[in-house]
């Protein structure tokens, strides 16, 4: 009913991993480097990164009716953010601080996306936009904004999985 092949996701596992993602996203945010807060208003990320919106079926009723839509949206977002965290935005200069949890965050995003899409199953894939290469002077701001957007995304995903674990688990 929820993942390809008609099976449900491991709601409890997804809940635990999404909660871990929330913690990691919040701990990573201040550690990406000094951020001049005047930069915050430069550009909006809203059109450039995935968001979970009203029509995505992630409300309790939508999850009851068919959680497939919501889970596919979450999966797409996880893949997008996983790609971002593995890109030169985070791997290039200036280097991340040694104690940055971005590596763990990257691995956890991949782990949750794999839980949602087991081996051999495939969502109808929505094209993930290709990223322009980042330049060194752009990266601090990009890291800051991506992690801030990711916080919002995983917070919604965690609520979805908490609801699923409580009400939709077999």
């Amino acid at each position: 009913r929820a993942v390809p092949g008609g099976s449900s996701p491991a709601w409890t596992q997804c809940q635990q991993l999404s909660q871990k993602l929330c913690t990691l996203a919040w701990s990573a945010h201040p550690l990406v480097g000094h951020m001049d807060l005047r930069e915050e208003g430069d550009e909006e990320t809203t059109n450039d990164v995935p968001h979970i919106q009203c029509g995505d079926g992630c409300d309790p009723q939508g999850l009851r009716d068919n959680s497939q839509f919501c889970l596919q949206r979450i999966h797409q977002g996880l893949i997008f953010y996983e790609k971002l965290l593995g890109s030169d935005i985070f791997t290039g200069e200036p280097s991340l601080l040694p104690d940055s949890p971005v590596g763990q965050l990257h691995a956890s995003l991949l782990g949750l996306s794999q839980l949602l899409q087991p081996e051999g199953h495939h969502w109808e894939t929505q094209q993930i936009p290709s990223l322009s290469p980042s330049q060194p002077w752009q990266r601090l701001l990009l890291r800051f904004k991506i992690l801030r957007s990711l916080q919002a995304f995983v917070a919604v995903a965690a609520r979805v999985f908490a609801h699923g674990a409580a009400t939709l688990s077999p």
Partner: antibody, heavy 123, light 106 residues
Framework: EVQLLESGGGLVQPGGSLRLSCAAS????????MHWVRQAPGKGLEWVSV????????WYADSVKGRFTISRDNSKNTLYLQMNSLRAEDTAVYYC????????????????WGQGTLVTVSS | DIQMTQSPATLSLSPGESATLSCRAS??????LAWYQHKPGQPPRLLIY???HRATGIPARFSGSGSGTDFTLTISSLEPEDFAVYYC????????FGQGTRLEIK
């Protein structure tokens, strides 16, 4: 219509200083990173420097690092290039340039250019 | 830094002919390459971005192709106003320009 107008060029002796300005109009200046690009006589284009939209971050070509300072005044829609310890090889037409794309994941190609201002370093 | 090499340095052709300009990067730049036209006393003009996308207002006779390290700008039927210097620019890592190709009337 986007307009960029450079000024401040002229003749200066080696070791001297000069400040270039670029007055911008026709777009929301404070939302765009801005660049300086130069062309020496008979030579190709060379990227010089960039400044982030608020002025919080800057970057320079190795050839000018430590001698040139890029800055901006968003209240005046103006970009600056302070050039110190000038050398003969800094002789060039200096252009200010704006990217073709805004947004977060932007590509660094130049859609809009000023007419340029000539800097001549000679004794 | 990534070096950009353009060839030929000078290309002599007549109006109506087709021009092929080459640009080679010292390492892969993906498709993060732009082409500019530059005439004396004027600022450079963006022709092509992302290797093959024509900029706004650029005539269809200009086309770009290539990826990785080898790129081509083709002008299908030269107009008198096309004779100028052409530069390629990579933006995969920092920003570097080629040394230019001068397209002159034969």
């Amino acid at each position: 219509e986007v307009q960029l107008l450079e000024s401040g060029g002229g003749l200066v002796q080696p070791g001297g200083s000069l400040r270039l300005s670029c007055a911008a109009s026709g777009f929301t200046f404070s939302r765009y990173e801005m660049h300086w690009v130069r062309q020496a006589p008979g030579k190709g284009l060379e990227w010089v420097s960039v400044i982030s939209p608020s002025g919080g971050r800057t970057w320079y070509a190795d050839s000018v690092k430590g001698r040139f300072t890029i800055s901006r005044d968003n209240s005046k829609n103006t970009l600056y290039l302070q050039m110190n310890s000038l050398r003969a090889e800094d002789t060039a037409v200096y252009y200010c340039a704006k990217l073709g794309t805004g947004g977060v994941f932007k590509s660094t190609y130049f859609q809009h250019w000023g007419q340029g201002t000539l800097v001549t370093v000679s004794s | 830094d990534i070096q950009m090499t353009q060839s030929p340095a000078t290309l002599s052709l007549s109006p109506g002919e087709s021009a092929t300009l080459s640009c080679r990067a010292s390492q892969s730049v993906g498709t993060y390459l732009a082409w500019y036209q530059h005439k004396p006393g004027q600022p450079p003009r963006l022709l092509i971005y992302d290797a093959s996308h024509r900029a706004t207002g650029i005539p269809a006779r200009f086309s770009g192709s290539g990826s990785g390290t080898d790129f081509t700008l083709t002008i299908s039927s030269l107009e008198p106003e096309d004779f100028a210097v052409y530069y390629c620019q990579q933006y995969r890592s920092l920003i570097t320009f080629g040394q230019g190709t001068r397209l002159e009337i034969k």
